[in-house]
Amino acid sequence: SGVFQLQLQEFINERGVLASGRPCEPGCRTFFRVCLKHFQAVVSPGPCTFGTVSTPVLGTNSFAVRDDSSGGGRNPLQLPFNFTWPGTFSLIIEAWHAPGDDLRPEALPPDALISKIAIQGSLAVGQNWLLDEQTSTLTRLRYSYRVICSDNYYGDNCSRLCKKRNDHFGHYVCQPDGNLSCLPGWTGEYCQQPICLSGCHEQNGYCSKPAECLCRPGWQGRLCNECIPHNGCRHGTCSTPWQCTCDEGWGGLFCDQDLNYCTHHSPCKNGATCSNSGQRSYTCTCRPGYTGVDCELELSECDSNPCRNGGSCKDQEDGYHCLCPPGYYGLHCEHSTLSCADSPCFNGGSCRERNQGANYACECPPNFTGSNCEKKVDRCTSNPCANGGQCLNRGPSRMCRCRPGFTGTYCELHVSDCARNPCAHGGTCHDLENGLMCTCPAGFSGRRCEVRTSIDACASSPCFNRATCYTDLSTDTFVCNCPYGFVGSRCEFPVGLPPSFPW
């Protein structure tokens, strides 16, 4: 929908004559009739398919036409159309003489025509006026014209309807081409979708108007990116709503059970070492000189009988002192002043004198160690067995007892579980870290493909004429039970009509 606008600017008829050459009396009182129609290569009479318009008398003989002429006429002249502008047109402008006030065609003398011009061509929709001037032997007409779209119509041929709005159905204005231009804060095809607060979480937040962020259940925070833990969750967090993942040192469904009483309450006194031993439970290992559940009580240091080999203990301000019996020395009388003559080496150890007999050293036989060969050597202390193998002391040597699936001196070799072909019925064996897996052929299942799976031979509905189908589980084939009047392996032949075999 649009308007063809014609602006008449100046008409010159210096001699004041009609087209017939006859002069007007007293002068040519001039008005115009305009006919707008579809494009014609040669403009011919006929219906004004795009519209017509007439002016009142605009002047006598020669005159300039004002913008928006008085006397009820309008300049520019408006020729509205309610269709897609085709881009081409034909235009006929006739100047007529009006002897009286009645401008109807039937009221005018037959020779009242002053001049007639006809043009045709292309015209694109736009705001710019095209200026034209048409001259005949006696007259000259200067005018301009253009096509513009009606309100709410846009595009190259005024075919796009667009009406700006700011309501539930959309928030937009219209661009010159008729496309929607969303108002700030709105998006989407019809600008119905608000643009949420910048950074609002795409899944956990939403908005009903621009620049807000409403949180879905279980989420909170300015950008709805913080989950709300389970109600009752005390010392825990969440990564999705209503979770309760316990902080370190806490346990239980609501993370309210204290598993790290030592850290949270520091119950052990006097530098004792604290060990957690369950919920709200702990053990204090006291430093020498202290006792009590929390090592809160100070001991006499001699109470623990620190002096060995019959040494006597004497309390002192800064600790204690051991008085050793003959033949012993050291802080706790733990060292002996024995010599080889006292046979100090056990388990067949050989004694060697040192420092002119003031000291000795024991040379121990295999499997024994210690300063007096008093300790048996444990060859398993270094955990030599790999893959969970068990270490066994065997006299002077050791051996590893391997877990199933492993072999070698130290259980370091992995036995292939597939070596003994465990998969039945042609199943394919796959070695896994902790065992094996069988991939079974069609018709078999189970961990070792040992179970025969029946194939439903009736699934393809092979029986005709409403016959009942049965699967023979032993051969995976079907059998058709024919209704009365039909025969054949599929019940495909009516009785009495022999099958027409090709032989």
């Epitope: 807000e212 949180c215 909170q220 925070g221 913080e226 109600n231």
Partner: nanobody, 123 residues
């Protein structure tokens, strides 16, 4: 049953101070962001301040910035609003609430609400 109970309101002269408290029960207070909202006489509710669940992030409306301080004690299930340099325009019923939605300046939709405490600033 969820309950938010505000206290600490009263009549105070311009330039004076008040401390509002909000005690929560019926839900795990320490898991929720909290907010103070006020309704001046004859007007709609306006957001005052907010604090995140752990207490590490605080937010204030421009009108109270620098004068009011929000804080919380999760062990006591209590939210606080320390109001200094009070002005007559701070007169309102003050509510504590759990924010559910935020606008460009602060929260504007809420889940749980208290019943409110009246603060009047007048000479």
């Amino acid at each position: 049953e969820v309950q938010l109970v505000e206290s600490g309101g009263g009549l105070v002269q311009p330039g004076g101070s008040l401390r509002l408290s909000c005690t929560a029960s019926g839900f795990t207070f320490g898991n929720y962001d909290m907010s103070w909202v006020r309704r001046p006489p004859g007007k709609g509710p306006e957001w005052v301040s907010a604090i995140n669940s752990g207490g590490g992030s605080t937010y204030y409306a421009d009108s109270v910035k620098g004068r009011f301080t929000i804080s919380r004690d999760n062990a006591k299930n209590t939210l606080y609003l320390q109001m200094n340099s009070l002005k007559p325009e701070d007169t309102a019923v003050y509510y504590c609430a759990t924010p559910r939605g935020w606008g460009p300046t602060g929260p504007h939709e809420y889940g749980y609400w208290g019943q409110g405490t009246q603060v009047t600033v007048s000479s």
